[in-house]
């Protein structure tokens, strides 16, 4: 994608300005494109260092501008050169007084290896002097002054390479300044042939077309372009692919045009001399006018462009029928595209007959870098080409080129790429609240690292430690509730931020860890504690059924009221009861139990208990006696707890009866505090002693409590509270 | 789209002569060098004959020198190969190329000549 | 006539592991003056003509996907595939067309490990 132009205008110098112009036409050459004498063409030249000029009308080029008054320091041989991605181009000129004695036919004469070649030069002024000519500055010939001819002419039978360089001619009492020259090229292999070794074929570079001895490819005349030059580009315009336009008010007219050797330099198609401006004659055209055209049917001859062939016929005489040949064009590529980093499919869609085909479209990087398609297909009417970045990066914007070049012809179009950085959050979210199956978050979007605008954000989570993919919601507040999540589960989360505009998506942002709260099975059904022993309580429960097919157990947990002992204890869950034992005597204990899965369950309420007591119990405490009518009293009491009582006794008989002679009462309900004696006598005097009985024994009163009856018609005295047995 | 279309394979005793053509589009035809190869069953390639794009030029293998000959019709878009004095060793599946630089672009979708008594 | 030799013969490689196929010419393809290399590579698959990847030894050919890339210079090049497909499964070929006739090498199978 190289394509170096010089423009030499006017190579001819009188007092006019004159200029040199480097045009680097679509592409970006890594280094500033240089222009300097030629010293290898002309030692002798002046030595002044040039002031070279960036041309403000055009990219990439650079400009040599010499006012009038130094024309007397411009004759010489120049170059301009170009690089990209280590190949250098050089292209070379030259510059002459106007008011030398000879004038060259041409300024560059290109042959082919074998050639029989005549450089000549026109005799402009007659003088009485020997006439000399130099090649590249050492003098290589003399025509005594009597015998100078019109025409001084330097014959080659059989050209070389080693014969190519700047040709002088001038009368010996000249210089530099009166001397014209002319450039031989010699194409390093003969006519048609190309390679290292000369022994490849050219392909037919048409409209004088130069094949490269290197490479085989054609150099287009200015004014013509594709891969064989067979097309003409549009009026006044030149370049590889025909986008660079003359701005003169008659076109490419005085402009000289330089390409890399082998081409040299000629005219724009339609103009012819050497200064470049003078019209072509009718029924010829091309660079410095050297083609005929022939056309077949009668067409008009454009001086520019060849045969105008008539509709359904085409060729460079209208030889051949067949639709017309149109030039492509590039078609729905915007000037601007904003990109983000990552992946990127550009598309160079194109138009044109025949149409493009995958290999005559190509994409040019900022940096040169040519490529090609990577998929491609087309429709009746147009071309397209997608190419693949697989990751474009910032440094990879700037002014991408879509190339297109077909027999037709060829079109660039520069686009420029802006390259985004994707947004990351700089922080990990917040979690503000846990449930067992929701959280709620506070997203924490900004501040982020990347380029905005932020289009849309999602908030990715998922379990740690599972193998499953992430899942997201797409955000709009910054604060949002995750519903639906498992309990007891850690999760993670983190923020992605979506800019506009293809592959937006930014890299997720620093991850935050949450455990959600529990939640399992049910409690066992049908708790009950109870002492079994001195050391050991037994707790029992309905019998199990879970719903799923997850294993599960029970896990019962105890401790003391009075000790900080805590057991957890698992259970098989196709058990019912379990023995709790290695408690201490006359002790509380809590118990509590809850099914778990994999998940842990909900505990059941509290259960307490004590174990059975290793001591006989204390005396009922607060005995009263009350309620007393002629035929009954209410006797109530307190136990203390902890002692294992399991009954009370009430034991009364008449004062002054045998002992054998008592009654007793026995109350299995150690919960109940009072009890109603029934069917005494009246007027009568009793002894009531209490006792309470354990796994040991019966406690020992201290002493007995006295009743007395009241007669049989009076009201009972003392009423007394608490909960009574009828 | 650029297309190579080949013809007028088929079996040959040895001694005797084929024709094989090569019918173009897509392209201009009288801009290109056209070129012949050929690959014998289960072997590699081999380059046989090439022909300049006005058909002044003309190339050809030492192994068919002087039996081959390569010919072109750019007014009918068409390139011949003329194949005298056939060999057992000529049986090949033949392809017309056309360049891009010295390496062989755009190529026919071959022939199958078989040269056997 | 330079010949062309390429190394090895046959090759087998797992999907997705990257192949590597040498070619060595008889004589230097260098070209001092443009510092180019006149080296192509091409695929073939049964049944089809040969399909051009490579030229200048290194310029990827409009379309060929940019897992197949070309290396070396001077008498010794590589062909390599980055991360193997199943439609790469072919045979190839070098050329070299630095002076004529243009030569091929023998040619590599590539097969599915």
């Known amino acids: 994608a190289m394509d170096l132009i010089l423009i030499n205008s006017l190579p001819l110098v009188s007092d006019a300005e004159t200029s040199l112009t480097c045009i680097a036409s679509g592409w970006r050459p890594h280094e500033p494109i240089t222009i300097g004498r030629d010293f290898e063409a002309l030692m002798n030249q002046h030595q002044d260092p040039l002031e070279v000029t960036q041309d403000v009308t055009r990219e990439w080029a650079k400009k040599v501008v010499w006012k009038r008054e130094k024309a007397s320091k411009i004759n010489g041989a120049y170059f301009c050169e170009g690089r990209v991605r280590g190949e250098a181009i050089r292209i070379r000129t030259m510059k002459m007084r106007q008011q030398a004695s000879f004038l060259p036919a041409t300024l560059t004469m290109t042959v082919d290896k074998g050639d029989n070649v005549n450089i000549s030069f026109k005799k402009v002024l007659i003088k009485e002097e020997d006439a000399v000519i130099y090649k590249n500055g050492s003098f290589i010939h003399s025509v005594p002054r009597h015998e100078v001819p019109d025409i001084l002419e330097v014959h080659l039978p059989h050209a070389q390479p080693q014969d190519a360089g700047v040709y002088s001619a001038r009368y010996i009492g000249g210089n530099l300044f009166t001397s014209a020259f002319t450039r031989l090229i010699v194409r390093r292999c003969e006519a048609q042939k190309w390679g290292p070794e000369c022994n490849h074929l050219c392909t037919a570079c048409m409209n004088n077309g130069v094949c490269h001895e290197d490479t085989g490819e054609c150099i287009c005349p200015p004014g013509f372009m594709g891969r064989t030059c067979e097309k003409a580009c549009e009026l006044h315009t030149f370049g590889r692919t025909c986008k660079e336009r003359c701005s003169g008010q008659e076109g490419c007219k005085s402009y000289v045009f330089c390409l890399p050797d082998p081409y040299g330099c000629s005219c724009a198609t339609g103009w012819k001399g050497l200064q470049c401006n003078e019209a072509c004659h009718p029924g010829f055209y091309g660079p410095d006018c050297k083609l005929r055209c022939s056309c077949n049917n009668g067409e008009m001859c454009d001086r520019f462009q060849g045969c105008l062939c008539s509709p359904g016929w085409q060729g460079l005489q209208c030889e051949r029928e067949g639709i017309p040949r149109m030039t492509p064009k590039i078609v729905d590529l915007p000037d601007h595209i904003e990109v983000n980093s990552g992946k990127f499919n550009p598309i160079c869609k194109a138009s044109g007959w025949p149409l493009p085909t995958n290999e005559e479209m190509t994409l040019v990087k900022p940096d040169g870098t040519v490529l090609h398609p990577k998929d491609f297909n087309h429709t009746d009417h147009f071309s397209v080409a997608i190419f693949t970045i697989h990751r474009i990066l910032p440094p990879d914007s700037g002014v991408w080129v879509c190339s297109v070049n077909t027999v037709a012809g060829m079109v660039e179009k520069p686009f420029n790429i802006s390259v985004k950085v994707l947004p990351k959050p700089l922080n990990a979210p917040n979690v503000i609240d846990t449930g067992h199956n929701f959280a709620v978050i506070n997203i924490s979007s900004e501040p982020y690292f990347g380029d905005g605008p932020i289009k849309s954000k999602k908030l990715l989570y998922k379990p740690v430690n599972h193998y499953e993919a992430w899942q997201h919601i797409q955000v709009t507040n910054e604060i949002v509730t995750l519903n639906y999540l498992e309990p007891r589960t850690e999760y993670e989360l983190c923020v992605q931020l979506v800019r506009r505009g293809e592959g937006g998506e930014g890299h997720p942002g620093p991850v935050r860890r949450f455990t959600t709260a529990s939640i399992g099975l049910p409690p066992p059904r049908g708790l009950n504690l109870l002492p079994k022993s001195q050391t050991t309580l037994n707790l029992t429960w309905q019998p199990i059924f879970p719903s799923s097919e997850d294993d599960f157990y029970v896990e019962v947990e105890r401790r003391s009221v009075q000790k900080s002992d805590q057991q957890n204890i698992k259970v098989p869950g196709n058990l019912t009861s379990v023995l709790l034992n290695n408690l201490h005597p006359r002790e509380q204990y809590v118990v509590r139990a809850r099914v778990n899965t994999k998940a842990q369950g909900e505990w059941s309420e509290d259960l307490t208990a004590w174990t059975l007591s290793d001591i006989l119990p204390p005396q009922p405490e607060n005995i009263k006696i009350s309620n007393i009518t002629h035929s009954s009293a209410v006797i109530s009491w307190t136990i203390l707890d902890g002692y294992s009582i399991s009954s009370i006794t009430i034991r009364y008989k008449v004062q002054g009866k045998n002992e054998d002679q008592h009654v007793d009462v026995k109350i299995k309900n150690a919960t109940i505090t009072q009890y109603q004696l029934k069917g005494l006598e009246p007027e009568t005097a009793y002894q009531v002693d209490i006792f309470a009985e354990n796994n040991i024994g019966s406690s020992n009163p201290a002493f007995s409590h006295e009743l007395v009856t009241l007669p049989e018609s009076q009201a009972p005295a003392d009423l007394g509270g608490g909960k009574m047995l009828l | 789209q650029v297309q190579l279309v080949q013809s007028g394979g088929g079996v040959v005793q040895p001694g005797r002569s084929l024709r094989l053509s090569c019918a173009a589009s897509?392209?201009?035809?009288?801009?290109?060098?056209m070129h012949w190869v050929r690959q014998a069953p289960g072997k590699g390639l081999e380059w046989v004959a090439v022909i300049s794009y006005d058909g002044e030029n003309k190339y050809y293998a030492d192994s068919v020198k002087g039996r081959f000959t390569i010919s072109r019709d750019n007014s009918k878009n068409m390139l011949q190969l003329q194949m005298n004095r056939l060999r057992s060793e000529d049986t090949a599946v033949y392809y017309c190329?056309?360049?891009?630089?010295?390496?062989?672009?755009?190529w026919g979708q071959g022939t199958v000549i078989t040269v056997s008594s | 006539d330079i010949q062309m030799t390429q190394s090895p013969d046959s090759l087998a490689v797992s999907l997705g592991e990257r192949a590597t196929i040498n070619c060595k010419s008889s004589a230097s393809v260098l070209y001092s003056s443009n510092n180019k290399n006149y080296l192509a590579w091409y695929q073939q698959k049964p049944g089809q003509p040969p399909n051009l990847l490579m030229y200048w030894a290194s310029t990827r050919e409009s379309g060929v996907p940019d897992r197949f890339s070309g290396s070396g210079s001077g008498t010794d090049f590589t062909l390599t595939i980055s991360s193997l497909q199943a439609e790469d499964v072919a045979v190839y070929y070098c050329q070299q067309y630095y002076s004529a006739p243009i030569t091929f090498g023998q040619g590599t199978r590539l097969e599915i490990k």
């Open positions: 190329a056309t360049p891009k630089g010295g390496a062989l672009e755009i």
């Open positions: 897509g392209l201009t035809f009288s801009n290109y060098a």
